[in-house]
């Protein structure tokens, strides 16, 4: 601005938001995870940042461990405090199994449709939060190319923390979770060294989904 | 909601065999490990075992191995404990419990969140 | 095996006073698993604490665990009524589920 108070020139903002993304979050509710709540936090942290609302940023939340449960659809609630609400109610399902792949696949083909609110033409993220190898991993190569193929942004989680409980190697899990991120991977994949962990990486993964929005 | 009934209350003779019971709903039994703890009159809380519905994978602590037997029918969301010959020193109330948690990959871990109401067991 | 010691046995108390029960591992406890449960005469024990300091679902913040490695306290800020009961703390690091002897608390 000039002494007159006349623009000599502007500056372009660094993104401008649509802030319309359409995000399904992939829950392993499997036994192993452990405590729960541990994720119920994770998720209240993750939610109260976003803007949800029919014109704005929708969320639906699958869980998966043995067989897979829609929690809630995409267009279920129009607010972040409903959300918050139905996210702080979601139990554990349990079970011995992690059928990663199928979580995956389901999410893409019945949470991401429009009949459970999906929106056309507005991007589609995905966001993967697991702790162990899946028992289906056979499948997850297909699995992983199908959401290639419908342009769905993926961030993977690694909880490591049944395997440090078991002084088990991580090697083999974190290489299957880093293959479910979407490319580049040191921006859409994370590891956390047990579920506690969880709530740390928040902030990073929010800000990483919402330049997607640019 | 969750609820863990547990079989009534039995009185038997020494040498004899027993079964109780544990009948989960309100939630996917097959799904969560079930635990036993005994407690002796007057006596605190012992860990006895635990069980997997699904697949009736077992793990026993060492106090309790060979002296017990525990056992699952998925199809009816039911957990057992079972002597073969029991003994006075059995005179209990057994509780069965939901682990909110897990057993397997070299570990177990997690707390017992529902509890069953209890059975006594006297044997004399 | 961890070996818990709970102190005192016995507390003597009225109600509205604070209670501190102690709950001592013979070696770490690893991740902070500890748990602390209240049984009342004829009843099933009631889980209160998981993972040394968060309360289970419908326990009043009255009630409040603390602690790491092997010490452990759990402390009721107000005593009611009907919290006048035996509680045992339990650890879940080791593969196996150990509890403490218990410590009974008594209206004074």
């Known amino acids: 601005v000039s002494p007159t108070f006349q623009v000599v020139n502007s500056i372009a903002p660094v993104q401008e938001c649509s802030t319309q993304l359409d995000i399904v979050i992939v829950l392993d509710g499997s036994n192993s995870i452990y405590p729960w709540d541990s994720v119920t936090a994770f998720l209240n942290d993750l939610l109260e940042r976003m803007d949800i609302g029919p014109k704005q940023t929708q969320v639906g939340i699958v869980q998966y461990g043995e067989n897979v449960t829609h929690e809630f659809n995409l267009n279920k609630y129009s607010s972040t405090e409903e959300v918050l609400v139905a996210a702080k109610k979601i139990v554990q399902r349990g079970g011995r199994q992690t059928m990663t792949a199928l979580g995956i696949d389901t999410a893409r083909k019945e949470a991401f449709t429009e009949a459970r609110g999906a929106r056309r033409g507005v991007k589609k993220v995905m966001v993967i939060v697991t702790d162990g190898e899946s028992h289906d991993n056979h499948r997850l190569k297909k699995v992983i190319q199908d959401c290639e193929d419908e342009n769905i942004q993926r961030f993977s989680i690694a909880i490591l923390g049944s395997y440090n409980r078991g002084n088990l190697s991580t090697e083999k899990f974190v290489e299957e979770i880093k293959s479910i991120a979407s490319e580049p991977t040191e921006k859409h994949f994370f590891n956390v060294s047990d579920e506690l962990a969880l709530v740390t990486i928040v902030k990073a993964l929010g800000e990483r989904i919402f330049a997607l929005e640019a | 909601e969750v609820q863990l009934v547990q079989s009534g209350a039995e009185v038997k003779k020494p040498g004899e065999s027993l079964r109780i019971s544990c009948k989960g709903s309100g939630y996917s039994v097959s799904s969560y490990w079930i635990g036993w703890v005994r407690q002796m009159p007057g006596k605190g809380l012992e860990w006895m075992g635990i069980i997997y519905p699904g697949d009736s994978d077992t793990r026993y602590s060492p106090s309790f191995q060979g002296q017990v037997t525990i056992s699952a029918d998925k199809s009816i969301s039911t957990a057992f404990l079972q002597w073969i010959s029991l003994k006075a020193s059995d005179t209990a109330m057994y509780y069965c419990?939901?682990?909110?948690?897990?057993?397997?990959?070299?570990?177990?871990?997690?707390?017992?969140?529902?509890w069953g109401q209890g059975t006594l067991v006297t044997v004399s | 095996e961890i070996v818990l010691t709970q102190s005192p046995g016995t507390l003597s108390l009225s109600p509205g006073e604070r209670a501190t029960l102690s709950c001592r591992a013979s070696q770490t406890i690893s991740s902070g698993y500890l748990a602390w449960y209240q049984q009342k005469p004829a009843q099933a024990p009631r889980l209160l604490i998981y993972?040394?300091?968060r309360r289970a679902t419908g326990i009043p913040d009255r009630f409040s665990g603390s602690g790491s490695g092997t010490d452990f306290t759990l402390t009721i800020s107000r005593l009611e009524p009907e919290d006048f009961a035996v509680y045992y703390c339990q650890q879940y690091g080791s593969s196996s589920w150990t509890f403490g002897q218990g410590t009974t608390v008594e209206i004074k």
């Open positions: 419990a939901r682990l909110q948690g897990d057993c397997s990959g070299g570990s177990c871990y997690g707390h017992f969140d529902y």
């Open positions: 993972v040394a300091s």
